[in-house]
């Protein structure tokens, strides 16, 4: 804590400016107006202040905004803003895209931190469902973000924003996460003609049922076998070797390099020997 | 112990540019700030500027503006300082210097690296 | 900006002597640094926050002033002493330092 002193004769600050640079802590303190520092947050990010000015600063607005800071100093704030906790961000109230984009423009290339898990919850509970243009957002931000919201945070997803989720934001989703996403994405693609369909909906298809998988099987879709073994075991057992054949076209040979793994080698089980055998790749159930 | 490796002596002509090096060790680069300083023949010094390792951002003497461009590279713990079109004024001996906690003058100095500019 | 003005630039001391140089400014400042320069080497931090001794600095060495005036004294002159001392402030931006003080062993 810094103490209160008086400000020196000629050292009150009348703008954040480069002189600040060299302020001591207890002069940054006293000679500051903290409602000029509000209103000229802007400026304070282009100024080359140390850790130890910057928390003099933070706490000059702490103590102008007990309540939490307004949205016209937080959509400045940041390199300050990496010095909030999350109990500061939790007193926010963050409406606007352009302050939540400013405010994970500091932080990116960094791992998602507390600050930023908190914002963004802020921000998506503010908002009421995580919209198309949010998502784009976090997810160009954070290609894992999807997969980090629990099965039910997703269920708020409208289908509308399944368009902008790419295939990478989704390599962390376990199952249950896909099961959530899988109809969404279904609704969101359905007036989409047969391959292009299959393209927007592959990297869903881990939370897709076995009627699904059966109806991509009549159309040619040649399923890659990384997307295959990322399907539900419980939705392939009950497809049949002509239907699997048909679903994988000629990507069906590599089943015999994943014979030994889920869910080719539960599948494998189910079959009768007369129907691998007519794979012709020396699959044993 | 603290150390600030300053790049060698540099023989540039006149209209081209230089980029100093100042390469820190034994303490956490963006902790500290990096001022410059400029020394030319035996007088007195000049601080050129200073900037933030963590965030990149700078401050300069107005003299030396659209003159001297300070860069960090935080892999490497190094700062940098280029100086653009150069002339015979801008012959000298540089120095980098870390500047100390809270406003605590510039604790640590490079071993300087001499910038002379002849035809 | 504020301009630094030391004096005398150069002085001698015999071993044993009470040395004192000042800096005077030509507005207030709240603070003043002074650093040693040996012939070929870098400035080296020796006296920071008017009064405050760097590490490794001896106790013969003393600093204080406020506002305009300035200074530095050495209450016992030693060899190792002989420097050129400069004093440097950043109470008002952008920084600067004085002309120096050449100090030498007589």
């Known amino acids: 804590e810094v103490e209160k002193t008086a400000c020196p004769s000629g050292k009150k600050a009348p703008e954040i400016d480069e002189s600040l640079i060299f302020y001591k802590k207890w002069e940054l303190e006293a000679c500051v107006d903290a409602a000029l520092l509000a209103t000229q947050m802007d400026r304070v990010n282009a100024i080359p202040f140390t850790y130890e000015q910057l928390d003099v600063l933070k706490h000059k607005l702490d103590e102008l905004y007990p309540q939490g800071y307004p949205e016209s100093v937080i959509q400045h704030l940041g390199y300050l803003f990496l010095k909030m906790s999350p109990e500061d961000i939790r007193k926010w109230n963050v409406t606007s895209l352009e302050t939540l984009k400013a405010l994970l423009e500091v932080n990116k290339g960094h791992e998602m931190s507390p600050q930023v898990a908190t914002l963004i919850d802020r921000f998506v509970k503010g908002r009421g469902q995580l919209d198309k243009d949010t998502l784009d957002t976090l997810t160009a931000f954070y290609p894992g973000y999807l997969c980090s919201l629990s099965p039910e945070e997703l269920s708020s997803v409208p289908p509308s924003s399944i368009w902008a989720v790419r295939p990478q934001d989704l390599d962390t989703c376990d199952p249950r996460q896909l099961d959530v996403l899988y109809p969404k994405a279904r609704l969101a693609f359905q007036n989409m003609n047969g391959s292009e369909y299959f393209v927007k909906i592959q990297s869903f298809l881990g939370g897709a049922p076995t009627e699904d998988l059966k109806a991509l099987s009549q159309q040619n879709v040649s399923m890659d076998l990384a997307t295959f073994m990322k399907l539900r075991t419980d939705a392939v057992l009950p497809l049949t070797v002509a239907e699997v054949q048909k679903l994988l076209g000629p990507h069906v040979e590599g089943l015999k390099a994943e014979e030994r793994h889920r869910p080719v080698r539960d599948w494998i089980l189910r079959q009768r020997q007369d129907d691998l055998d007519t794979l012709g790749l020396g699959l044993q159930g | 112990e603290f150390q600030l490796q300053q790049s060698g002596p540099e023989l540039v002509k006149p209209g081209a540019s230089v980029k100093i090096s100042c390469k820190t060790s034994g303490y956490s680069f963006t902790d500290y700030n990096m001022n410059w300083v400029k020394q030319s023949n035996g007088k007195s010094l000049e601080w050129i500027g200073v900037?933030?390792?963590?965030?990149?951002?700078?401050g300069y003497n107005q003299k030396f503006k659209g003159k001297a461009t300070l860069t960090v590279d935080q892999s490497s713990s190094t700062a940098y300082m280029q100086l653009n079109s150069l002339t015979s004024e801008d012959s000298a001996v540089y120095y980098c210097?870390?500047?100390?906690?809270?406003?605590?003058?510039?604790?640590?100095w490079g071993h300087g690296t001499s910038v002379t500019v002849s035809s | 900006q504020i301009v630094l003005t030391q004096s005398p630039a150069i002085m001698s001391a015999s071993p044993g002597e009470k040395v004192t140089m000042t800096c005077s400014a030509s507005?207030?400042?709240?603070?003043m640094h002074w650093y040693q320069q040996k012939s070929g080497t870098s400035p080296k931090r020796w006296i920071y926050d008017t009064s405050k001794l760097a590490s490794g600095v001896p106790a013969r060495f003393s600093g204080s002033g406020s506002g305009t005036s300035y200074s530095l004294t050495i209450s016992s002159m030693e060899a190792e002493d002989a420097a050129t001392y400069y004093c440097q402030q950043w109470s008002s931006y952008p920084p600067t330092f004085g002309g120096g003080t050449k100090l030498e062993i007589k």
């Open positions: 210097a870390r500047g100390g906690y809270d406003g605590e003058a510039m604790d640590y």
């Open positions: 507005s207030s400042v709240n603070y």
């Open positions: 900037i933030n390792p963590n965030y990149g951002t700078t």
